[in-house]
Interface confidence: low
Amino acid sequence: AITEAREEAKPYPLFPGPLPGSLQTDHTSLLSLPHTSGYQPALMFSPTQPGRPYTGNVAIPRVTSAGSKLLPPLAFKHTVGHIILSEHKDVKFNCSISVPNIYQDTTISWWKDGKELLGAHHAITQFYPDDEVTAIIASFSITSVQRSDNGSYICKMKINNEEIVSDPIYIEVQGLPHFTKQPESMNVTRNTAFNLTCQAVGPPEPVNIFWVQNSSRVNEQPEKSPSVLTVPGLTEMAVFSCEAHNDKGLTVSKGVQINIKAIPSPPTEVSIHNSTAHSILISWVPGFDGYSPFRNCSVQVKEVDPLSNGSVMIFNTSASPHMYQIKQLQALANYSIGVSCMNEIGWSAVSPWILASTTEGAPSVAPLNVTVFLNESRDNVDIRWMKPLTKRQAGELVGYRISHVWQSAGISKELLEEVGQNNSRAQISVQVHNATCTVRIAAVTKGGVGPFSDPVKIFIPAHGWVDHAPSSTPAPGNADPVLII
């Protein structure tokens, strides 16, 4: 949209001279601009490219006899070079140029620190045409300035493929100090020195720093920013902050807590997840880490048995994932288990002790005196043995497992039988004649199957043979016996 500012015509002289005007600190108003009688100044906005002049409806008169005139070099008129103002104030500044009417299609753009200002900036270009020249005034306004508006602003005009550049206008926005580095929270060792850093900038400079510990100033004389505070050591938690001062006032940093590293709290909630005959899987919830990362944990295991010597087994493990499988335990035993974890300062107290039990183990010895003989009349093999001397930890005997392997003419077949715990003999049917039968027996408890006895072999002849001599477990160290009938 084009907005016209209509004023009553006043008798001003022609407009080739320098524009009057001055810029006020913290706020500038658009200059009142002279114009010749018969011309009305038009304020031109570009709806598509703010900051570019909109010349579509403005007639800049041609000078047809341009060849006969010597035109002076074009240049922007000098204006205020430096504007200082406080944050959140408004500012307006401009550049102006008189352009002979011979030139057409002039465009003015604003640049800040070498980059063109496009988009939603408040730029207005006004045109004041006369018989021979047109005065062009480009204004730039910023409402509620911020530090980011600091910089060097220039106008550029493109005319007949030539670029004309104005002198820079330096905008300096002053405000309260702005922190570029604030102190950070730390976890420190008791009575050990550490450093805190604070840095703030203006403008205006200089910026002075005061340090504050637990609401009390640490330094009586301020230090110029940046400042490093060396704390010789603390015995208890403290909160530090820094104050940054300049001519505009004071800014306070965030308060940071300095924690004193301590030994961790004991773990809690030790839980049993799984028990076997010789292992227990536990988990725990770590306690408070004492402001220092956990390094590792120690699982302490005591056998709960009046006859045990009360020694403690210690298993070291990583601090994560708060689980450990305790191994090398006795079967059918009661244990008291505690967990302690350490950080760089030391070990926590032990967690509350919990009771856990291992399950029955498998027997550790095989049945004794295994004897095998053929009862041909009933086509059976008789097997006899003696109950093994099992330890209490193996649990209650629930039975026996009998393995008998039949080998004949290169063919081998294994069969398994289960018999009850009250038995010390068994009969198995002859599977194949003219074959070797190899028998082994193992004791079974709820904890599992124990070792098998040494193999006893017996030869099963073809039908009609008579000898029924037994085969039996050999003495230790002897070769496997083979009884051929």
Epitope: S271, H273, V285, P286, S320, P321, M323
Partner: antibody, heavy 122, light 106 residues
Framework: QVTLKESGPGILQPSQTLSLTCSFS??????????VGWIRQPSGKGLEWLAH???????YYEPALKSRLTISKDSSKNQVFLKIANVDTADTATYYC??????????????WGTGTTVTVSS | QIVLSQSPAILSAFPGEKVTMTCRAT?????MHWYQQKPGSSPKPWIY???NLTSGVPARFSGSGSGTSYSLTISRVEAEDAATYYC?????????FGGGTKLEIK
């Protein structure tokens, strides 16, 4: 985005073995702290935790069902499996798999699958 | 085994009312977790580690408790809160769920 999807046979007969698969995306079971669990819910009844497996291959089972349950994983395929042996009509339920959130001092099921319905019927 | 008992089994409330459901454990647990389930949907984590609301849970929900007694409270019930809420402990294997409290809106 983390998602989990259960799949199973739908219907099977008593004494058969139920095989369930949980296929997931958005996380890896090779990463520290990751776990996946199985929970079931008979129609109109409450939830029952069955088993779960951690990234380091530790496995935990509901003690009353432990002898029938087997949980396993294939981290490269982003899958977790549950087998229930010797099923009975009491195993008829919707079976869910869920990712476990591993906090510093707590754990909970933070993302659940949509569930797969399993019917055991002769 | 830690048994979790939820009460009441069914809770009826008018919109805008304040309601509280409880979960009691037969042994002490460190944290309680709560899940919301609507018919035909899978459970959703609702409150974890006793009092932390999961992302997207309205601030009218809160959790509290310790030891063997925990509760879930809704300060002003809305129609969308109608669901069954389950408590769950992860302190001791087996990791049990409560039987659920069904919240009905009148």
């Amino acid at each position: 985005q983390v998602t989990l999807k259960e799949s199973g046979p739908g219907i099977l007969q008593p004494s058969q073995t139920l095989s369930l698969t949980c296929s997931f995306s958005g996380f890896s079971l090779s990463t520290f702290g990751m776990g996946v669990g199985w929970i079931r819910q008979p129609s109109g009844k409450g939830l029952e935790w069955l088993a779960h497996i951690w990234w380091y291959d530790d496995k935990y089972y509901e003690p009353a069902l432990k002898s029938r349950l087997t949980i396993s994983k294939d981290s490269s395929k982003n899958q977790v499996f549950l087998k229930i042996a010797n099923v009975d009509t009491a195993d008829t339920a919707t079976y869910y798999c869920a990712r476990i959130y591993y906090g510093t001092s707590y754990r909970y099921f933070d993302v659940w699958g949509t569930g797969t319905t399993v019917t055991v019927s002769s | 085994q830690i048994v979790l008992s939820q009460s009441p089994a069914i809770l009826s409330a008018f919109p805008g009312e304040k309601v509280t459901m409880t979960c009691r454990a037969t042994s002490s647990v460190r944290y309680m977790h709560w899940y919301q389930q609507k018919p035909g949907s899978s459970p959703k984590p609702w409150i974890y580690a006793t009092y932390n609301l999961t992302s997207g849970v309205p601030a009218r929900f809160s959790g509290s408790g310790s030891g063997t007694s925990y509760s879930l409270t809704i300060s002003r019930v809305e129609a969308e809160d109608a669901a069954t809420y389950y408590c769950h402990q992860w302190s001791s294997n087996p990791y049990t769920f409560g039987g659920g409290t069904k919240l009905e809106i009148k």
